[in-house]
């Protein structure tokens, strides 16, 4: 875009403590706003500043300022991502797993010096309060993951920040929002019982203990009914269920029955992230030749 | 007197694209924003994104953003819009206005509105 | 985004009544810097593109006859027409102009008996 030669805004930056988006105004405009992000803007107290609520310190965000007349803007980054170009933590990635432990992975740039030492934060969306990572993974010294085994300073979408320091060059940072409900890794199903009469076998199990208050509807099960002894390649059955209120599942199986397994794994609805398979459970008998299920 | 003159209605296909045209006169063009504003048949209205004519910067609503693009003509005082991958939801009538002097935001002139159809 | 919500969605009023419309705003249109109220009203007229019509709640756009005049504060505002005229038959919209995407209300259209 033409550079204006005589810019009636001037100077802008960030007053970070005070969170007053400032600026040098060199004429008369008629009004003027700032925008964050183009997510979303605000009027300027009297053509002098805008007063924001919630900056992030760490968090690269563009504001820009606009005039109504004449027609003008201009922005600045807050704060500035500065370091050497492909020195910050990369391939990151958390996953909460036995609903309340979670681990974060990361590694190094790849132009990070060897002296290189990176540090995880990370800050709920309430932005009250942040959590230091409690416990680093390490690879020759370096940290290249966290193990959190308390989560009680997350909500439902978290801002994680990699830091690094290096005593030779600046270390860029690494950012990412991440919604808790995307990196849970569910337990599989546990209490998984099997039970048949003459007709039927009912199966019945437990959902999974997690992080996120889910109700029995939030949950899609798959139950894997597996003959024994059969030929390999042979199809499993593998049967979708709905969360309930009661998890069960019976289906026709007369007596006599082959022996045969089932193990269960669960997933969020919405994500359809699956979980490992639980223990099968046998049942039936050894007999080869009795009937399928 | 200001004017704001769109060009024609477009019947266009699913997964075309349509450029439309806004010549405005009557006032010094670079003064003021050209802004865009969509209306579905029947329903409410949707800003678009605006342009600042003297350097082609933009500002557009994030709903709109990949799927239109704003640019100007200085010299003929035209303001253009492009639209990308049409579906039928973007079957509406398509106004360009031009800002007010005291705020950026505010719709102060329109022109006639060009209708788009997107029809297989 | 500020949702914008416009009740009724449509009245019938005769000639020379006086008519109201309410437009409410999920979040708070009033600037405390300069204590204004970001909100905007426009009409629109059957086959004509909409009209500017009232700014900062109740600053009538020049041109704009008397008998319109907008009020209220915050998240809560009405446009009155004192004495209804043939030619006021039209859709009137509220604009949330406070911040990004200044999203529109679903309109209040009008008819005349």
């Known amino acids: 875009t033409k550079e204006d030669p005589n810019p009636p805004i001037t100077n802008l930056r960030m007053k970070a403590k005070a969170q007053q988006l400032t600026w040098d105004l060199n004429r008369n405009v008629t009004d003027i706003e700032c925008v964050k992000d183009a997510d979303y803007s605000m009027p300027a107290v009297n053509n002098s500043y805008c007063q924001f609520g919630a900056i992030s310190l760490c968090e690269v965000t563009n504001y820009t300022v606009r005039v109504a007349n004449p027609p003008f803007s201009t922005w600045i980054l807050f704060p500035e991502n500065s370091g050497r170009e492909g020195t910050a933590a990369q391939n990151f990635s958390c996953f909460i797993y036995n609903a309340d432990l979670m681990n974060c992975t990361w590694a190094r740039g790849p132009t990070a010096p060897r002296d290189v030492q990176y540090f995880l934060y990370i800050r709920n969306s309430k932005r009250r309060r942040e959590i230091r990572c409690p416990y680093y993974i390490q690879d020759s010294g370096t940290h290249v993951g966290c193990h959190l085994d308390n989560l009680s300073g997350l909500t439902s979408r978290n801002y994680f920040l990699v830091n690094g320091t290096s005593r030779e060059i600046g270390i860029q940072f690494f950012d990412s929002l991440l919604d808790t409900k995307k990196i849970e890794r569910f337990n599989p199903p546990s209490n998984v019982t099997v039970r048949c009469n003459t007709t039927h076998c009912l199966v019945r199990w437990k959902q999974p203990r997690t992080y996120q208050k889910l109700s029995y509807l939030d949950f899609q099960y798959q139950l894997d009914v597996h003959r024994k002894n059969t030929q390999p390649g042979t199809e499993n059955l593998l049967i979708n269920v709905s969360g309930d209120l009661e998890n069960r599942y019976n289906f026709p199986s007369s007596e006599p029955r082959a022996k045969h397994s089932v193990k269960i794994r669960a997933a969020d609805v919405r994500i359809l992230n699956w979980s490992s398979w639980s223990e099968a459970i046998e049942f039936g008998s050894d007999d080869g030749n009795l009937g399928s299920v | 007197e200001v004017q704001l003159q769109q060009s024609g209605p477009e019947l266009v296909k699913p997964g075309a694209s349509v450029k439309m045209s806004c010549k405005a006169s009557g006032y010094t063009f670079t003064d003021y924003y050209m802004k865009w504003v969509k209306q579905s048949h029947g329903k409410s209205l949707e800003w678009i994104g605006d342009i600042i004519p003297s350097n082609g910067a933009t500002f557009y609503n994030q709903k709109f953003k990949g799927k239109a693009t704003l640019t100007v003509d200085r010299s003929s005082s035209t303001a253009y819009m492009h639209l990308n991958s049409l579906t039928s939801e973007d079957s509406a009538v398509y106004y360009c206005t031009r800002s007010h002097l005291l705020r950026a935001s505010w719709f102060a002139y329109w022109g006639q509105g060009t209708l788009v159809t997107v029809s297989a | 985004d500020f949702v914008m919500t416009q009740s009724p969605s449509s009245l019938t009023v005769t000639a020379g009544e006086k008519v109201t419309m309410s437009c409410k705003s999920s979040q708070s249109l009033l600037n405390s810097g300069n204590q204004k109220n970001y909100l905007t009203w426009y009409l629109q007229k059957p086959g004509q593109p909409p009209k500017l019509l009232i700014y900062?709640?109740?600053t009538r756009e020049s041109g704009v006859p008397d008998r319109f005049t907008g009020s209220g504060s915050g998240t809560d505002f009405t446009l009155t027409i004192s004495s209804v005229q043939a030619e006021d038959l039209a859709v009137y919209y509220c604009q949330n102009d406070y911040s990004y995407p200044y999203t529109f209300g679903g309109g209040t259209k009008l008819e005349i008996k």
């Open positions: 900062w709640a109740s």
